[in-house]
């Protein structure tokens, strides 16, 4: 808390501007009118403001909005967003993309803060789904983020929005996720050909049955063993050696080199000698 | 639902061979989706594998014990066993069996037996 | 064979404390790794499959996450029952491999 003072003659602010980062604390506390502040707070980021005097910027701010701050301020926190608490910005309320890319500019480059996490929370939920724009923006912004979201949160991702995801953005989903992803990536790219379905449906495929990648065997697709070893066990295990011989195409060679890893060893195991030996690999079922 | 006992000798020389039997009951060894596995707990140390074999007969072992191990499955009695070979004071812990599902893990272990190779 | 060293090999935490277990594979086990629970004298009990799915049975504060090499358990609020050493163990190369244990104890 700063204490209350009075401003001395001749220092009330009358703008924001770079003679404000000569004001001790107490004076910027005393001499800066909150109503101010707020209705240009987007000056406040061209200044090289310390930390310390950022707190008392904030502290501001609170006082004149205890119930949260508008988008219009929101939108020019800049810098002054760091500042912030996941408390302070479980209050807001945001509903424009523009805010929200302002924010996640401010924090490029790092990893996912609290913050982030609760501004997009709040973001997604004050829009009742993740839209392909949003999601556009927050994959951009975090390659990561689609995944590490919860099975739960993954299910209000309307079909229309898979059309934003990218192969990168499932690096790090796991199967649950996946399982949840598929069958909207499945609705969204029903009505494209055989193989452009199959490499927009390839990054998805972690989340597939065992139907559907018998019905792929029989499409020439040639999956490549990456992408064989992101399926399911249980969608894989039951597939025959001439299947996994169809679907794979030319990669059905690179079943040696995967041979100890799952679910490669798994779908081995449990196929017949006779059968593993029509694939010349040398496996050992 | 599945449960597992290990049986054997507790006390093993050096140099000798441990033998031990687990038996499945309420379950079958010959399940589709079942690998089963032994895994071993030195007194007051951590859990190491040993192996595992699949009903077809099929095996997979550590690499560290490979040369010592032998697992093997009766599928008419619904039991499997392990067989290591040239024991020192090492080997003793205690031995678990445990059924091993493709699509989760160990998820059912029998109670565990000590052995101990002493002369 | 894939190294999983976990950390820290012993904690202690009070009832209600928030507890995260670490455990970093040697290379890669994409997300086949599985957490386990063992009190005194009895046999491991699975907890998490496939590095963050909850095994029937499990209490809902036990979560886990992570890919790649690097994983985590999480007990959101420790009960009296959760005292005991913690095991990670990775499934995707046929050599099977455990961590070293985290010991949970009393403060």
């Known amino acids: 808390e700063v204490e209350k003072t009075a401003c001395p003659s001749g220092k009330k602010a009358r703008e924001i501007d770079e003679s404000l980062i000569f004001y001790k604390k107490w004076e910027l506390e005393a001499c800066v009118d909150a109503a101010l502040l707020a209705t240009q707070m987007d000056r406040v980021n061209a200044i090289p403001f310390t930390y310390e005097q950022l707190d008392v910027l904030k502290h501001k701010l609170d006082e004149l909005y205890p119930q949260g701050y508008p988008e219009s301020v929101i939108q020019h926190l800049g810098y002054l967003f760091l500042k912030m608490s996941p408390e302070d910005i479980r209050k807001w309320n945001v509903t424009s993309l523009e805010t929200l890319k302002a924010l996640l500019e401010v924090n490029k480059g790092h990893e996912m803060s609290p913050q982030v996490a609760t501004l997009i929370d709040r973001f997604v939920k004050g829009r009742g789904q993740l839209d392909k724009d949003t999601l556009d923006t927050l994959t951009a912004f975090y390659p990561g983020y689609l995944c590490s979201l919860s099975p739960e949160e993954l299910s209000s991702v309307p079909p229309s929005s898979i059309w934003a995801v990218r192969p990168q953005d499932l690096d790090t989903c796991d199967p649950r996720q996946l399982d949840v992803l598929y069958p909207k990536a499945r609705l969204a790219f029903q009505n494209m050909n055989g193989s452009e379905y199959f490499v927009k449906i390839q990054s998805f495929l972690g989340g597939a049955p065992t139907e559907d990648l018998k019905a792929l065997s029989q499409q020439n697709v040639s999956m490549d063993l990456a992408t064989f070893m992101k399926l399911r066990t249980d969608a894989v295990l039951p597939l025959t050696v001439a299947e996994v011989q169809k679907l794979l195409g030319p990669h059905v060679e690179g079943l040696k080199a995967e041979e100890r890893h799952r679910p490669v060893r798994d779908w081995i195991l449990r196929q017949r000698q006779d059968d593993l030996d029509t694939l010349g690999l040398g496996l050992q079922g | 639902q599945v449960q597992l006992q290990e049986s054997g000798p507790g006390l093993v020389k050096p140099s000798e061979t441990l033998s031990l039997t687990c038996t499945v009951s309420g379950g079958s060894v010959s399940s589709y989706y079942s690998t089963w596995s032994w895994i071993r707990q030195p007194p007051g140390k951590g859990l190491e594998w040993i192996g595992y074999i699949y009903y077809s007969g099929s095996t997979n072992y550590n690499p560290s014990l490979k040369s010592r191990v032998t697992i093997s499955v009766d599928t008419s009695k619904n039991q499997f066993s392990l067989k290591l070979s040239s024991v020192t004071a090492a080997d003793t812990a205690v031995y678990y069996c445990a059924r091993e599902d493709a699509l989760t893990g160990f998820d059912i272990w029998g109670q565990g037996t000590m052995v101990t190779v002493s002369s | 064979d894939i190294q999983m060293t976990q950390s820290p090999s012993s904690l202690s935490a009070s009832v209600g404390d928030r507890v995260t277990i670490t455990c970093r594979a040697s290379q890669s086990s994409r997300y086949y790794v599985n957490w386990y629970q063992q009190k005194p004298g009895k046999a491991p009990k699975l907890l998490i499959y496939?590095?963050?799915s909850l095994q029937s049975g499990v209490p809902s504060r036990f979560s886990g996450s992570g890919s790649g090499t690097d994983f985590t358990l999480t007990i959101s609020s420790l009960q009296p029952e959760d005292f005991a050493t913690y095991y990670c163990q990775q499934s995707y190369d046929a050599s099977y491999t455990f961590g070293g244990g985290t010991k949970v104890e009393i403060k």
């Open positions: 496939a590095a963050s």
